[in-house]
Interface confidence: low
C-alpha cells in the first residue's frame, strides 16, 4: 500500500480510537451514569489520572490528525515527494502518540489491577488492591462494593476498553512511525497532481 493511503487509513483509525478513549474516561467519572460521585474523593486515582483523556485521547489525537494530513496531497515540495514535510511531522507525532498510548495503557492496567475505590463494610478504599487482579475472575466479590452502585463492572468494562484501545493505538502509532519514516525517505507513490492541495 502507498505510504500516503496507509497514513490516512491509520490516522482515521487513531482518531476513532481517541474518541473511544475520551468517552470511556468521561464515563469513568460518572460511575453507573451518576454524577453525584464525581466531586467527591470516591473515585479511584486511575480515573483522575485521565489516562484515556490525556494519554489515549489528546496525545494520540495529534498523530492521528498528522497521519491524516500526511496522507493528503503535498504542500511542501512538488509532486509525489510533496508530502515529505508532513510525513516527517507524522514521524515525531507518532512517537509522541506511542508515549500517550503507553501512559493510557499503564494507567488503565493499574486501574484494572487495583480495582475501583468503593465503599465496603462502611469503609471507602481500594478493597481489591491486595488481590493482584484476581478479583476480575471472581464476580461474587464484585457485589461487595456497596457504593457507587455497580462500580466494579462499570470500571472493569471501561478500563478494559481503554486497555484494548491503547494497545491498538500503540500498534497503529508504531505502524505510522514506520510508514511515515518510509514516506520521508521514499516519498508517496501517487501520481503528480496539478494542484498542491
Amino acid at each position: 500500500m502507498c505510504t500516503g493511503k496507509c497514513a490516512r487509513c491509520v490516522g482515521l483509525s487513531l482518531i476513532t480510537l481517541c474518541l473511544v478513549c475520551i468517552v470511556a474516561n468521561a464515563l469513568l467519572l460518572v460511575p453507573n451514569g451518576e454524577t453525584s460521585w464525581t466531586n467527591t474523593n470516591h473515585l479511584s486515582l486511575q480515573v483522575w489520572l485521565m489516562g484515556g483523556f490525556i494519554g489515549g485521547g489528546l496525545m494520540v489525537l495529534c498523530p492521528g490528525i498528522a497521519a491524516v494530513r500526511a496522507g493528503g496531497k503535498g504542500c511542501c515540495g512538488a509532486g509525489c515527494c510533496g508530502n515529505r514535510c508532513r510525513m516527517l511531522r507524522s514521524v515525531f507525532s507518532s512517537a509522541f502518540g506511542v508515549l500517550g498510548a503507553i501512559y493510557c495503557l499503564s494507567v488503565s492496567g493499574a486501574g484494572l489491577r487495583n480495582g475501583p475505590r468503593c465503599l465496603m463494610n462502611g469503609e471507602w478504599g481500594y478493597h481489591f488492591e491486595d488481590t493482584a487482579g484476581a478479583y476480575l475472575l471472581n464476580r461474587t466479590l464484585w457485589d461487595r462494593c456497596e457504593a457507587p452502585p455497580r462500580v466494579v463492572p462499570w470500571n472493569v468494562t471501561l478500563f478494559s476498553l481503554l486497555v484494548a484501545a491503547s494497545c491498538l493505538e500503540i500498534v497503529l502509532c508504531g505502524i505510522q512511525l514506520v510508514n511515515a519514516t518510509i514516506g520521508v525517505f521514499c516519498g508517496d507513490c501517487r501520481k503528480k497532481q496539478d494542484t498542491p492541495h
Partner: antibody, heavy 114, light 112 residues
Framework: QVQLQQFGAELVRPGASVTLSCKAS????????MHWVKQTPVHGLEWIGA????????AYNQKFKGKAILTADKSSSTAYMELRSLTSEDSAVYYC???????WGQGTTVTVSS | DAVVTQTPLSLPVSLGDQASISCRSS???????????LHWYLQKPGQSPKLLIY???NRFSGVPDRFSGSGSGTDFTLKISRVEAEDLGVYYC?????????FGAGTKLELK
C-alpha cells in the same frame, strides 16, 4: 497486617493542650478514613470524629468541636489529634480506629491533673 | 443523633448458657446506600475493643460460630449460643450509619 500504633500515656496540666499520634502500617494510609474514639468509665465509648488523610477533610461529633483537632501527615502515615483547653473531664483513653473493619490502636491514656 | 440503647447493662451467666443482648436505636440504621452499619464489639479489661459482628449479622474473621447477630431497622440482637470463659467482658453495639457514629453503653457479661 494492619496496625495502628499509639503511645501509652500522657500526663498534662489543666488548661494545656496535648497532641496524640497514631502511626498506621500494613495498608495504604491515604485510602481509609481514620476515626478517634474517647472512652471513660462514665460515658463509655464516644466517637470524636474522623479524618480523610488523602484530602484532610474532617467530620466531628458536635460535642467535640473546638476540643479536638484532627490532622494527618501522609508522608509518615500518622494521624494526629490535638486536644485543647484540657480539664479533668478530658481524662480518658483515646483510641484511633477504623471502626467499620475492626482495627483499633492500643489506646493512649490521657490524665489531666495539676 | 442516633441514640443506641443497649439492654441489659449487666448479664450474669453460667458457662454453657445462652446469652442474648439487645440493642435499640432511636432511628433506623439503614444507610442511604441500603446497608445497615450495626456492629458488635467485645472489650476485655485493658484491651481495645474487638470486632465480632459487622453489618448486623456477618461474623468477623476468626469469630466463633457461637456468636450470631440479627435484627433490622432499629432493633438488633447479639446471641451467644454457649458462653465460654473467653467470652466474658463488655459488649458494645456500634452504629456507623449516621454521623455522629454512636456506641451503646455496653453490656457486661459476667459469671453468676
Amino acid at each position: 497486617q494492619v496496625q495502628l500504633q499509639q503511645f501509652g500515656a500522657e500526663l498534662v496540666r489543666p488548661g494545656a493542650s496535648v497532641t496524640l499520634s497514631c502511626k498506621a502500617s500494613g495498608y495504604t494510609f491515604t485510602d481509609y478514613e481514620m476515626h478517634w474514639v474517647k472512652q471513660t468509665p462514665v460515658h463509655g465509648l464516644e466517637w470524636i470524629g474522623a479524618i480523610d488523610p488523602e484530602t484532610g477533610g474532617t467530620a466531628y461529633n458536635q460535642k467535640f468541636k473546638g476540643k479536638a483537632i484532627l490532622t494527618a501527615d501522609k508522608s509518615s502515615s500518622t494521624a494526629y489529634m490535638e486536644l485543647r483547653s484540657l480539664t479533668s473531664e478530658d481524662s480518658a483513653v483515646y483510641y484511633c480506629t477504623r471502626p467499620y473493619l475492626g482495627y483499633w490502636g492500643q489506646g493512649t491514656t490521657v490524665t489531666v491533673s495539676s | 443523633d442516633a441514640v443506641v440503647t443497649q439492654t441489659p447493662l449487666s448479664l450474669p451467666v453460667s458457662l454453657g448458657d445462652q446469652a442474648s443482648i439487645s440493642c435499640r436505636s432511636s432511628q433506623s440504621l439503614v444507610h442511604s446506600n441500603g446497608n445497615t452499619y450495626l456492629h458488635w464489639y467485645l472489650q476485655k479489661p485493658g484491651q481495645s475493643p474487638k470486632l465480632l459482628i459487622y453489618k448486623v449479622s456477618n461474623r468477623f474473621s476468626g469469630v466463633p460460630d457461637r456468636f450470631s447477630g440479627s435484627g433490622s431497622g432499629t432493633d438488633f440482637t447479639l446471641k451467644i449460643s454457649r458462653v465460654e470463659a473467653e467470652d466474658l467482658g463488655v459488649y458494645y453495639c456500634f452504629q456507623g450509619s449516621h454521623i455522629p457514629l454512636t456506641f451503646g453503653a455496653g453490656t457486661k457479661l459476667e459469671l453468676k
